[in-house]
């Protein structure tokens, strides 16, 4: 008796965070034996879509020509082979940006900060929101969530960083969202460039602290430190 069919791989191109109106392609890759691919969307009647395999039959393409709120959500795919259905893939979370107006991102006391000191990034929205996200460009794990307790809505969230090192330098944006759909985000804030200069005692960053390439500290989640950032908001890392 053969074991269960290997689960397929699910991914999105150009990525899983898509601006409203832009196109996105979801790919499901199974095996050469696949006869049919199905895509399930959480809380939708299954299957959300089905496709015949593309030659050489080991994957299928699910096209979304124009991203809207309806497409945002959590997906899994699976395939049928001559011996039955595969296990479902790991989930893909498709997020749409542009659902709400853009927040403002600023740095306190300044976007120019000395290594070893503290800085707080402040994300402010015009209307009350209950989730704020901070994203650092080119980070493998870019999302930092601040979600309000008990559904209380806030106009802003603070992301404190202490002590700052050269790794914290870079370009940031923030988003705001409502808790009823974590897959719908605001337009991105304008970018904020955080510039970290060397301390007086250490004018040149050591090699281990320098701005890294692909496999270095940039690939680690940005973890804020310090006290709870804002009354009613709690830190939530995903």
């Amino acid at each position: 008796q053969a074991g269960p069919l290997p689960k397929p791989t699910l991914w999105a191109e150009p990525g899983s965070v898509i601006s409203w109106g832009n196109s996105v392609t979801i790919w499901c890759q199974g095996t050469l034996e696949a006869r049919e691919y199905r895509l399930d969307k959480e809380e939708s009647p299954a299957p959300w879509d089905r496709q015949n395999p593309l030659e050489p039959k080991n994957k299928a393409r699910f096209s979304i020509p124009s991203m809207t709120e309806d497409y945002a959500g959590r997906y899994r795919c699976y395939y049928r082979s001559p011996v039955g259905w595969s296990q479902p893939s790991d989930p893909l979370e498709l997020v749409m940006t542009g659902a709400y107006s853009k927040p403002t991102l600023s740095a306190l006391p300044s976007p120019l900060v000395t290594s070893g000191k503290s800085v707080t990034l402040l994300c402010q929205s015009r209307s009350p929101m209950d989730t704020f996200l901070l994203i650092k460009e080119r980070a493998a794990h870019p999302l930092l969530h601040l979600r309000s307790e008990h559904g209380a809505q806030q106009h802003q969230a603070e992301f404190p960083m202490s002590p700052v090192t050269s790794v914290h330098g870079g370009t940031y944006r923030c988003f705001s969202s409502h808790g009823f759909s974590h897959y719908l985000l605001s337009h991105p804030s304008d970018p904020l460039e955080l510039i970290v200069s060397g301390s007086l005692e250490d004018p040149r960053p050591s090699p281990t602290r320098s701005v890294s390439t692909a496999a270095g500290p940039e690939d680690q989640p940005l973890m804020p430190t310090g006290s709870v950032p804002h009354s009613g908001l709690r830190r939530h890392w995903e």
Partner: antibody
Framework: EVQLKESGAELVKPGASVKLSCKAS????????MHWVKQRPGQGLEWIGE????????NYNEKFTSKATLTVDQSSSTAYMQLSSLTSEDSAVYYC?????????????WGQGTALTVSS | DIVMTQSPSSLSASLGGKVTITCKAS??????IAWYQHKPGKGPRLLIH???TLQPGIPSRFSGSGSGRDYSFSISNLEPEDIATYFC????????FGGGTKLEIK
Amino acid sequence: EVQLKESGAELVKPGASVKLSCKASGYTFTSHWMHWVKQRPGQGLEWIGEINPSNGRTNYNEKFTSKATLTVDQSSSTAYMQLSSLTSEDSAVYYCARGNLTTVVPFDYWGQGTALTVSS
Amino acid sequence: DIVMTQSPSSLSASLGGKVTITCKASQDINKFIAWYQHKPGKGPRLLIHFTSTLQPGIPSRFSGSGSGRDYSFSISNLEPEDIATYFCLQYDLLLTFGGGTKLEIK
């Protein structure tokens, strides 16, 4: 009881368009894909395409991509197929058929068919 | 596309007798074949799926068998209401139908 009731026979002129309907009852309309099948006189059946009533996603037989357009109206549990630029080759009986997801079988219930005649 | 060759195109049999219809696929269809009964003015009725699985409510007089490329469908103890056209459908890869068999009673 699952039922698929299709619209009545149509006589249309070449070059025109026609919209056939298929009203579903006896089950949750949005939980099953709806397929359309063509049968020309004295010939076999051909699969045209399918639509997911819950979100409007469609898949077509390549042969029919520029001929047929599938839509649904959730409020009336009705599926539609519009056929455009009609020629005598489109004269046929068209069936709607419900997809069965649990057994993989594409069609477990069918409508009675709509006869389309294209003639000047 | 997979081609399904169904035979015979028509046949005549006696009440109480048995008939067998075959469908041959142009390639292995891994038992993904269904059989339907079609009467004039009505929609086709699903009798059997996955080669031999009888649909609920279908009498056991109907049966199916086969594997690989070769499949058969039989009706035993023929009754008057069995007069119809029968066709196969493969759903292993895309969807293609057999040409149909018209059954008449002698």
